[in-house]
Interface confidence: low
């Protein structure tokens, strides 16, 4: 078995102020176990965006169900994009681990740009 | 019958613009995405693009950055691709395709039957 | 960008015999990989989807295989109408890469 890869297929995302981004994201394997997180950014002043485990994150909507047995997709939306959330956006794999997970894999990132609200 | 309905053929003058439409029915709109892909005469396939027709957010092939443009009018379900300065080997048959959303379910299970371009001067 | 080698370029074949398609990626794409069919003057047509999983409303006679860089449609009995070009297609990175299509033509 191949080992696991995390994909983000687009390496920039256009949106208009106002709508919604969808960002995505997949996997190419079940191993190892663990949550997945998105971040805006990279190293150590990166922002959590999602986290499948835990919080509340009430712009964030996943486009797959998440509880679904074998699922790979882990893709978000993210609505009324204003143009402070341009960013690069990374999908990230960590594996389970005591007491805390442990950072796995990244996606190569998604580049959020954001357009005038059309007038 | 869920379907995608393309508009006609088109001639157009090298420079000129074209603007390409893709209506689909019997299926939720906004639920896929809508990517655009090009045949050249007795050529393979060429993926030119996407539009998520729920929030209008667009990603193009590097190659057509700058004369391409993808919209949509949720209101009619209709997709748009427009193509501009036009040179002669952009005549080709425009196909529009939808993709599921989620990642892992990334193909084109429907196709217009496809809209001729030709550019002669 | 990935690129999809497929092969061979033309295959001749009579009806009822047993057609083998090759595709290739230049890294590897898992089992994300896609075949369609056009025939003359049509669109293409989903076949088979992340390698091996026929699409609605294709017939059993088409199958997939493969995973990470080598492919195979296999068609194990060509009837009239399954004489067309096929495409292989990754969608695992972005941009989505087609392969140049195999013809399948009347021997």
């Known amino acids: 078995e191949d080992e696991l890869q995390v994909i983000q297929p687009e390496k920039s995302v256009s949106v208009a102020a106002g709508e919604s981004a969808t960002l995505r994201c997949a996997m190419t394997s079940l191993i190892p176990v663990g949550p997945i997180m998105w971040f805006r950014g990279a190293g150590a002043g990166r922002e959590l965006i999602y986290n499948q485990k835990e919080g509340h994150f009430p712009r964030v909507t996943t486009v797959s169900e998440l509880t679904k047995r074998n699922n790979l997709d882990f893709s978000i939306s993210i609505s009324n994009i204003t143009p402070a959330d341009a960013g690069t956006y990374y999908c990230v794999k960590f594996r389970k681990g005591s007491p805390d997970d442990v950072e796995f894999k990244s996606g190569a990132g998604t580049e959020l740009s954001v357009r005038a609200k059309p007038s | 019958q869920v379907q995608l309905v393309q508009s006609g053929a088109e001639v157009k003058k090298p420079g000129a613009s074209v603007k390409v439409s893709c209506k689909a029915s019997?299926?939720?709109?906004?639920?896929?995405?809508m990517h655009w892909v090009r045949q050249a005469p007795g050529q393979g396939l060429e993926w030119m693009g996407w539009i998520n027709p729920s929030s209008g957010g667009t990603n193009y092939a590097q190659k057509f950055q700058g004369r391409v443009t993808m919209t949509r009018d949720t209101s009619i379900s209709t997709a748009y691709m427009e193509l501009s300065r036009l040179r002669s080997d952009d005549t080709a048959v425009y196909y529009c395709?939808?993709?599921?959303?989620?990642?892992?379910?990334?193909?084109?299970?429907?196709w217009g039957r496809g809209t001729l371009v030709t550019v002669s001067s | 960008e990935i690129v999809m080698t497929q092969s061979p370029a033309t295959l001749s074949l009579s009806p009822g015999e047993r057609a083998t398609l090759s595709c290739r990626a230049s890294?590897?794409?898992?089992?994300?990989l896609a075949w369609y069919q056009q025939k003359p003057g049509q669109a293409p047509r989903l076949l088979i989807y992340?390698?091996?999983n026929r699409a609605t409303g294709i017939p059993a006679r088409f199958s997939g295989s493969g995973s990470g860089t080598d492919f195979t449609l296999t068609i194990s009995s060509l009837e009239p109408e399954d004489f067309a070009v096929y495409y292989c297609?990754?969608?695992?990175?972005?941009?989505?890469?087609f392969g140049g299509g195999t013809k399948v033509e009347i021997k």
């Open positions: 395709a939808r993709e599921g959303i989620a990642a892992t379910d990334a193909y084109f299970d429907l």
């Open positions: 297609q990754q969608r695992l990175f972005h941009p989505p890469t």
């Open positions: 992340d390698a091996s």
């Open positions: 890294q590897s794409v898992s089992s994300y």
């Open positions: 019997g299926y939720t709109f906004t639920g896929y995405y």
